[in-house]
């Protein structure tokens, strides 16, 4: 049904879905704090631009009676129930900030006539790609996939002289929401990653992973997994690892690696960690937070969602344009706005671009060091450490297939 939007005459409302099932187990209070901080900044920015308007947020809570798993498994219907609640109340804002679960976002997008923008902190899966009115403020799986293919093909760096075309992917079903969809994308037979690789096998059991580490008949030296160092240690322990094994640990929303006092444990020496560059800081600056880094990224995406809305509202109001139009709904893409931690760039499809950082453990210092960075906006790799102190032979990454000569 057509719901009137509370979005005109100098009063602009943001509908914030506060779902019990969410990509990260973040207290809703923290999300509220993030939204409120964003509102305070947006009001200030609009006022500074001479726009005397009111901007508020309405928090829409689900009753949590039916959909109470707390994770994303029962989020599909929860999202639709919240939309129904908005519809019944005849109260929709100019923009919907909310669903973080891929399931709920996909279903809500499918089942509604979206004439308003939807901003998501999450929705990592490939099924949420290329949605005309959806903006995603945390790196989606497509961005990871493009990095991996780019890195696999790279063969002209001092530390990587072989193209790779094979990989194992470890995926045991206990992953967090972000990891689940990242690995899901790598597993999908029709995905870009699968298309570009000659060999790819998914390891689903701990024992399969453990056996590969020393299996002389393995088909690839490269194993991709997703999680933190502790997750890897639980799986790998202190087991011996063949010298040409490379583990790629995807841990995007964790900037503990950049803290000054962090020492890499010994079991990380065969590992390259893929993470995100830590916000507005220089790499290797020290900082501390009492929120776990992942949770800060999640709440920050809500905050940046508010700032993005403020950015678009300012542009449309300054141009004398109507907010409740398809043009506004489709405008949340292909732009850069001032986010809380610095500029935020959205690509042509409304997905956040970022700098991914590949780290290695220095055998000399036992510290994490930046090997290279990758700009998702231009799909380009930039080497940082031309003479890394690797554990691998000759300080070069091995070939992905044992015994295969230079290519």
């Amino acid at each position: 049904s057509q719901v009137s939007q509370n979005c005109h005459n100098g009063s602009y409302e943001i509908s914030v879905l506060m779902m019990g099932n969410s990509a990260f187990a973040e207290p809703l209070k923290n999300l509220e704090d993030a939204v409120n901080e964003g509102l305070e900044i947006v009001r200030g920015r609009l006022q500074n631009a001479g726009l005397n308007v009111t901007v508020n947020a309405t928090f829409m809570y689900s009753d949590g009676l039916i959909h109470n798993s707390g994770d994303c498994r029962s989020s599909t219907c929860e999202g639709l129930d919240l939309l129904r609640k908005i519809s019944n109340a005849q109260r929709m804002g100019c923009v919907l900030i909310g669903p973080s679960c891929t399931y709920s976002t996909f279903q809500m997008y499918l089942d509604t006539e979206l004439s308003y923008p939807m901003i998501s902190a999450g929705s990592f899966g490939l099924s949420c790609d290329y949605k005309e009115t959806l903006t995603r403020l945390m790196s989606p799986a497509r961005k990871l996939m493009y990095f991996l293919v780019n890195f696999w093909k790279t063969n002209d760096l001092p530390f990587k002289t072989y193209s790779w075309s094979t990989s194992y992917v470890y995926k045991n079903g206990t992953e967090t929401e972000d990891c689940f969809w990242y690995l899901n994308a790598l597993e999908a037979s029709v995905s870009y990653f699968s298309h570009e690789l000659g060999f790819k096998v998914v390891l689903r059991q701990d024992k399969e992973f453990q056996d590969i580490l020393m299996d002389h008949n393995r088909k690839s030296n490269v194993i991709i997994m997703c999680g933190g160092p502790e997750f890897l240690y639980k799986l790998k322990g202190d087991r011996a690892v063949a010298e040409d094994i490379v583990i790629i640990l995807v841990d995007l929303f964790n900037d503990q690696y950049f803290e000054d006092n962090v020492t890499a444990p010994d079991y990380m020496k065969n590992v390259l960690v893929l993470t995100l560059s830590p916000g507005n800081s220089l790499l290797n600056s020290s900082f501390s937070r009492n929120l776990s880094p992942t949770k800060r990224d999640f709440a920050l995406a809500y905050l940046n969602g508010i700032l993005l809305f403020g950015h678009m509202l300012k542009i449309f109001l300054e141009n004398g344009e109507n907010i409740t139009t398809p043009k506004f709904a489709h405008a949340f893409r292909n732009l850069t706005f001032e986010g809380y931690d610095g500029p935020v760039t959205l690509d042509d499809w409304g997905d956040v671009d970022s700098t991914m950082v590949l780290l290695y453990t220095s055998v000399d210092t036992k510290k994490y060091k930046v090997l290279l960075t990758y700009d998702t906006h231009v799909n380009k790799t930039y080497p940082v450490d031309m003479s890394p102190t690797f554990t691998w032979k000759n300080s070069k990454l091995p070939n992905d297939i044992t015994g295969r000569g230079p290519q």
Epitope: D33, N290, L291, D341
Partner: nanobody, 115 residues
Framework: EVQLVESGGGLAQPGGSLRLSCAAS????????MTWVRQAPGGRLEWVAK????????YYADSVKGRFTISRDNAKNSLYLQMDSLRAEDTAVYYC????????WGQGTLVTVSS
Amino acid sequence: EVQLVESGGGLAQPGGSLRLSCAASGFTFSRYWMTWVRQAPGGRLEWVAKIKYDGSEKYYADSVKGRFTISRDNAKNSLYLQMDSLRAEDTAVYYCTRDYNKDYWGQGTLVTVSS
């Protein structure tokens, strides 16, 4: 260990001025938005002013706009609040806080405006 220490509070006449300082340590100050928050006796917390990590954006609550000025010196890890044209209703304990979720607070400094 993260620490925020406020100073500069005291007794001021209506129409007078005070300058509050907040010394930060234990984290990279230049990465964080900072906010001054106040709590009047028996009242609720109210944000007063906030400043971006590089000082390029400053925002004020309507109640203090035009009278208070927030600033920072990242080289000295310090946050400031210049309070002019003070009123009785500015009487409160003033806290400096870090980041959007105000995850760290100082012990506060009491400002009393009275004739």
